[in-house]
């Protein structure tokens, strides 16, 4: 399997929320054997690999942000620290998982990175991960809601949504 | 505070039985998965055992498989190991530790001796 | 299962010397691969993931590198609580194993 990542950059707006977004693609095994963890972080653009340093979001851990369950179940984070810290992870029946950050700040701007972990049972694990760049902006070169650039090309997609809401 | 306190351990004669307990604080214990690990006396470390959040799947070294148990209550944050048909080379200190998905053992107690001798 | 070979056995240095240890895949673990410190009569703590990366308050002075089956422990300049054993552990494969361990000693 693989995570595809929508869109490779967001830009938004000071106080807007966001909705970054993973996808599991390929085959997926749904079979009792197979149980899928999925989290997400922040982290640097690395000289070997993306993604490997994990760093928190907003003071959460990618521990704190974690989903795990089967295949193409559906999954929420419950955790009031998450949601005291203005984030959600979430993931549907199709592979799609994310990460809302509400009220967002200079301070959000950075990398991202989903991580998902595939566990056979009795054999190896196996681990895959997408990174996408979130730009906050302020001022009056800021846009007026979220602005999505395709990870395939370089069309850029404009989020209508309004300051405090929630959007994908 | 975030820790891990093993329990349980003492001397035992070959072929006997003990069960280590592992109290956990400090975290949700329900969101790790959890491994015991061990160490005998003046050696490396040896991975024994290894359970999901949930309870299932369960993993063991094929050193212990069949002889000891893992199992946890996530109500009561507490891991346990039952061990059975001890042997002399079972005798190390039991180290239960955190864990999870694609991560390594970034919180670990402080150990409990389980001699096995007659 | 994966044999790791940790060299050398022992190593002997004094307080403000550069460290180097070494860990040996007997196959890649691409990437997955921790090193721990342990200190007498303590529990193993978690120094570097993923072959490069430092946990949560390690010190500047470790670094990891390496993937495959060669990786490298770095201390740059012993500390005195850096006298300890220190133990690489992959997480590619089941089982998960460790290293023999390298103990760092005061010369």
């Known amino acids: 399997f693989k995570v595809a990542t929508p869109y490779s950059l967001y830009v938004c707006p000071e106080g807007q929320n966001v909705t970054l977004t993973c996808r599991l693609l390929g085959p997926v095994d749904k079979g009792h054997d197979v149980t899928f963890y999925k989290t997400w972080y922040r982290s640097s653009r690395g000289e070997v690999q993306t993604c490997s340093e994990r760093r928190p979001i907003r003071n959460l851990t990618f521990q704190d942000l974690h989903l795990h369950h089967g295949g193409h179940q559906a999954a929420n984070t419950s955790h009031d620290l998450a949601q005291r810290h203005g984030l959600e992870s979430a993931s549907d029946h199709h592979g799609n998982f994310s990460i809302t950050m509400r009220n967002l700040t200079l301070l959000d701007s950075g990398l991202y990175c989903c991580l998902v972990v595939e566990i056979r049972h009795h054999h190896s694990e196996h681990r895959v991960h997408g990174a996408m760049e979130l730009q906050v902006q302020t001022g009056k070169d800021a846009p007026s809601n979220c602005v999505v650039y395709p990870s395939s090309s370089q069309e850029s997609e404009n989020i209508t949504a309004h300051h405090h809401h929630h959007h994908h | 505070q975030v820790q891990l306190v093993e329990s349980g351990g003492g001397l035992v004669k070959p072929g006997g039985s003990l069960r280590l307990s592992c109290a956990a604080s400090?975290?949700?214990?329900?969101?790790?998965?959890m491994s015991w690990i061990r160490q005998a006396p003046g050696k490396g470390l040896e991975w024994v055992s290894y359970?999901?959040?949930?309870?299932?799947?369960?993993y063991y070294a094929d050193s212990v498989k069949g002889r000891f148990t893992i199992s946890r209550d996530n109500a009561k944050n507490s891991l346990y190991l039952q061990m059975n048909s001890l042997r002399a080379e079972d005798t190390a200190v039991y180290y239960c530790?955190?864990?999870?998905?694609?991560?390594?053992?970034?919180?670990w107690g402080r150990g409990t001796l389980v001699t096995v001798s007659s | 299962e994966i044999v790791l070979t940790q060299s050398p056995a022992t190593l002997s240095l004094s307080p403000g010397e550069r460290a180097t240890l070494s860990c040996r895949a007997s196959q890649s673990v691409s990437s997955y691969l921790a090193w721990y410190q342990q200190k007498p009569g303590q529990a193993p703590r978690l120094l570097i993931y993923d072959a490069s990366n430092r946990a949560t308050g390690i010190p500047a002075r470790f670094s990891g590198s390496g993937s495959g089956t060669d990786f490298t422990l770095t201390i740059s300049s012993l500390e005195p609580e850096d006298f300890a054993v220190y133990y690489c552990q992959q997480r590619n494969n089941w089982p998960y194993t460790f290293g023999q361990g390298t103990k760092v000693e005061i010369k």
């Open positions: 400090g975290f949700t214990f329900s969101d790790y998965y």
């Open positions: 530790a955190r864990d999870l998905p694609g991560w390594y053992f970034d919180l």
């Open positions: 359970i999901s959040n949930s309870g299932s799947p369960i």
